[in-house]
């Protein structure tokens, strides 16, 4: 019986460890600067790295610019978006800017898109200063179903900071749905 | 056999609970205001509380101003940095400020330092207002290996808000590495 | 013995799954716009949704405007607060604003209230621009005891953005206390 108990414990440790890893999807996606749209309008950002630098993904899928949930659960979602402008990057056409991020959830089964989180600021970036910078951070806890998609929309995409430590978003599963 | 099963279940509950706790390192470090560097340049903040007020640490080490990882895993890292200035503190050297935070990871084995997250804003803190305040929040999900060190760099350290609810950083382990 | 082992494994899977769910309280509360206080002073926000839209709660209690902890543990707490003003809403009483959030913990057993996190910014919202917006995000890892209460205080509540994606706060349990 002791041998059996050891076997039970052993198999359980393996099973518990394995199931725990399987049960915790995550992603951290960093901006792909080679493909940032221009313009000052609100756009969906579709180019992100998931497999280089700090970018990583497990038990979730990145496709067509969207982070796809493969496993029902409650997830903590976050985004950090940095905007910047240097006078050498061109003259600002307006000093009054609305620098915003929207984290959206799209359900394919019932075609609909909803904003989960938003953040940002109106800014006055005058031509008197040679450099301007502003970062937004949002985060929250949401119930996500398999097949649902998370995407990021921003205003003024041409002002995005292309560094991997500056513009990124991510998610990690915290717990199952009851 | 029933007694044995009860023993298996019992030992398992203890083991599961114990291993779960051991597997979840965390830290929440609050600024040590008695030792904030002066100046407006970018500096590494080395004085943090880990054992008073909201400061706490478990299965991680705080040494030489750095938060040291003791256990491989995926961690959620965060930082909240507040800057403030009151006219009674004297005039600012410049009204145009770059208030920034950088969360960096240093690997001792392969001596190298990388910025994981950055945030902040350029600000115009004019003399027309007697009080100025600004906070930055960043957060993200990162793979950390045992021995790696997390540290915080800021610009304009003399403007830091010394309250424990204002200037802090932290980490908690979410899951093991596969 | 094999049958017994299967039974052990089976009951354990149920027990583990059940205890895991029970061990992970959470809440995501979104602003109730029908009851936002007016004025520019600092107030406690007492009206939040916990059961509609993105609002949700499990193994925690929402009562009298406070999020009550039912289970000891270490929790990640977060808040996102958006302020906005459009010229059609009338003139601002002052162009110099202090837009702040304070996440506080109240202990009933030892009557006391403490600020866990704060964030915000002083802003100059001039009449030259027809629209102004600003968001704050804070987050941190805290030890909470059963019966303790979390609440949100803000300055300038009349400027709050009433959208559920804009103004919210939440918590989720990460681990037990040793």
């Amino acid at each position: 019986i002791r041998a059996e108990k050891a076997m039970v414990d052993g198999s359980w440790l393996d099973l518990a460890k394995r199931s725990k890893l399987e049960a915790q999807p995550f992603a951290h996606l960093t901006i792909n600067a080679t493909d940032i749209p221009s313009g000052s309008h609100k756009v969906s950002l579709s180019s992100w790295y998931h497999d280089r630098g700090w970018g990583k993904i497990s038990n979730m899928t990145f496709s067509n610019g969207k982070l796809i949930v493969n496993q029902d659960g409650f997830y903590y979602l976050y985004a950090n978006i940095c905007f910047r402008h240097h006078e050498t990057s061109g003259d600002l056409a307006t000093e009054y800017l609305q620098l915003m991020v929207y984290v959206t959830k799209t359900s394919i089964k019932i075609p609909s898109s909803h904003t989960l989180m938003k953040g940002g600021s109106t800014k006055y970036w005058s031509g008197n200063s040679e450099f301007h910078f502003y970062s937004i951070n949002v985060g929250g806890f949401f119930k996500l179903r398999s097949g649902e998609e998370i995407s990021i929309e921003v205003s003024n995409p041409s002002l995005l900071d292309p560094d991997q430590d500056a513009t990124y978003f991510g998610a990690f599963k915290v717990r199952d749905i009851d | 056999i029933r007694a044995e099963k009860a023993m298996v279940d019992g030992s398992w509950l203890d083991l599961a609970k114990r291993s779960k706790l051991e597997a979840q390192p965390f830290a929440h470090l609050t600024i040590n205001a008695t030792d904030i560097p002066s100046g407006s340049h970018k500096v590494s903040l080395s004085s943090w509380y880990h054992d008073r007020g909201w400061g706490k640490i478990s299965n991680m080490t705080f040494s030489n101003g750095k938060l040291i990882v003791n256990q491989d895993g995926f961690y959620y890292l965060y930082a909240n940095i507040c800057f403030r200035h009151h006219e009674t503190s004297g005039d600012l050297a410049t009204e145009y400020l770059q208030l920034m935070v950088y969360v960096t990871k240093t690997s001792i084995k392969i001596p190298s330092s990388h910025t994981l997250m950055k945030g902040g804003s350029t600000k115009y803190w004019s003399g027309n207002s007697e009080f100025h305040f600004y906070s930055i929040n960043v957060g993200g999900f990162f793979k950390l290996r045992s021995g790696e060190e997390i540290s915080i760099e800021v610009s304009n350290p003399s403007l830091l808000d010394p309250d424990q609810d204002a200037t802090y950083f932290g980490a908690f382990k979410v899951r093991d590495i596969d | 013995i094999r049958a017994e082992k299967a039974m052990v494994d089976g009951s354990w899977l149920d027990l583990a799954k059940r205890s895991k769910l029970e061990a992970q309280p959470f809440a995501h509360l979104t602003i109730n716009a029908t009851d936002i206080p007016s004025g520019s002073h600092k107030v406690s926000l007492s009206s939040w949704y916990h059961d509609r839209g993105w609002g949700k709660i499990s193994n925690m209690t929402f009562s009298n405007g406070k999020l009550i902890v039912n289970q000891d543990g270490f929790y990640y707490l977060y808040a996102n607060i958006c302020f906005r003003h459009h010229e059609t809403s009338g003139d601002l009483a002052t162009e110099y604003l202090q837009l702040m959030v304070y996440v506080t913990k109240t202990s009933i057993k030892i009557p006391s209230s403490h600020t866990l996190m704060k964030g915000g910014s002083t802003k100059y919202w001039s009449g030259n621009s027809e629209f102004h917006f600003y968001s704050i995000n804070v987050g941190g890892f805290f030890k909470l005891r059963s019966g303790e209460e979390i609440s949100i205080e803000v300055s300038n509540p009349s400027l709050l953005d009433p959208d559920q994606d804009a103004t919210y706060f939440g918590a989720f349990k990460v681990r037990d206390i040793d």
Epitope: S38, G39, S89, G90, D91, A93, T94, E95, S126 | - | -
Partner: antibody, heavy 122, light 108 residues
Framework: EVQLLESGGGLVQPGGSLRLSCAAS????????MSWVRQAPGKGLEWVSG????????YYADSVKGRFTISRDNSKNTLYLQMNSLRAEDTAVYYC???????????????WGQGTLVTVSS | EIVLTQSPGTLSLSPGERATLSCRAS???????LAWYQQKPGQAPRLLIY???SRATGIPDRFSGSGSGTDFTLTISRLEPEDFAVFYC?????????FGQGTKVEIK
């Protein structure tokens, strides 16, 4: 239809001053950045100066910095270029041009006015 | 500042032929922020292309732009009599905004 009409050009001696105007119509003038671009006789195009829609920020080519001042009167839908300390090399046709307003960075020029000739000579 | 060099200086072609104009930048043009203009004698320039490849309103589809980084091209697939003029490229990815010296497309 968007229309831009420049005026104020003419003959001026070196060291002299001139003020160019550009009357705009057919669009919400205050919402768009505007620029001046010049073209010396038989030469290419050179951007001279730009101004944001509000008039709060102004930009200049190094060749005219400190001598030229761009401004606008949004109530009159008019753009100005005050040119001081004029030199022979400032001789050119001066065009006013509208920014597209679709990017946060001042970008291409569309449309252009018909231009006004400035001749700096003794 | 970014220097734009256009080639050839002059292009002699007949109506119906294909014209290929080159614009080379001294450093990479950020975000494909490049425009093309056509200027006829005694007239103001007219916008043809922006964003390296987007046609302006009312521009015939025989005009097309391509390229990125430092090398950009304007192509006129079949020259019409009214197309003969001077063509300029302009970058707006960095300050100051600069123009190429122009390519003259003349009737052969």
């Amino acid at each position: 239809e968007v229309q831009l009409l420049e005026s104020g050009g003419g003959l001026v001696q070196p060291g002299g001053s001139l003020r160019l105007s550009c009357a705009a119509s057919g669009f919400t003038f205050s919402s768009y950045a505007m620029s001046w671009v010049r073209q010396a006789p038989g030469k290419g195009l050179e951007w001279v100066s730009g101004i944001t829609g509000s008039g709060g920020s102004t930009y200049y080519a190094d060749s005219v910095k400190g001598r030229f001042t761009i401004s606008r009167d949004n109530s009159k839908n008019t753009l100005y270029l005050q040119m001081n300390s004029l030199r022979a090399e400032d001789t050119a046709v001066y065009y006013c041009a509208k920014d597209p307003g679709t990017t946060v960075i001042m970008s291409w020029f569309d449309p252009w006015g018909q231009g006004t000739l400035v001749t700096v000579s003794s | 500042e970014i220097v734009l060099t256009q080639s050839p200086g002059t292009l002699s072609l007949s109506p119906g032929e294909r014209a290929t104009l080159s614009c080379r930048a001294s450093q990479s043009v950020r975000g494909r922020y490049l425009a093309w203009y056509q200027q006829k004698p005694g007239q103001a320039p007219r916008l043809l292309i922006y964003g390296a490849s987007s046609r302006a309103t009312g521009i015939p589809d025989r005009f097309s732009g391509s390229g990125s980084g430092t090398d950009f091209t304007l192509t006129i697939s079949r020259l019409e009599p009214e197309d003969f003029a001077v063509f300029y490229c302009q970058q707006y990815g960095s300050s100051p905004r600069t123009f190429g010296q122009g390519t003259k497309v003349e009737i052969k």
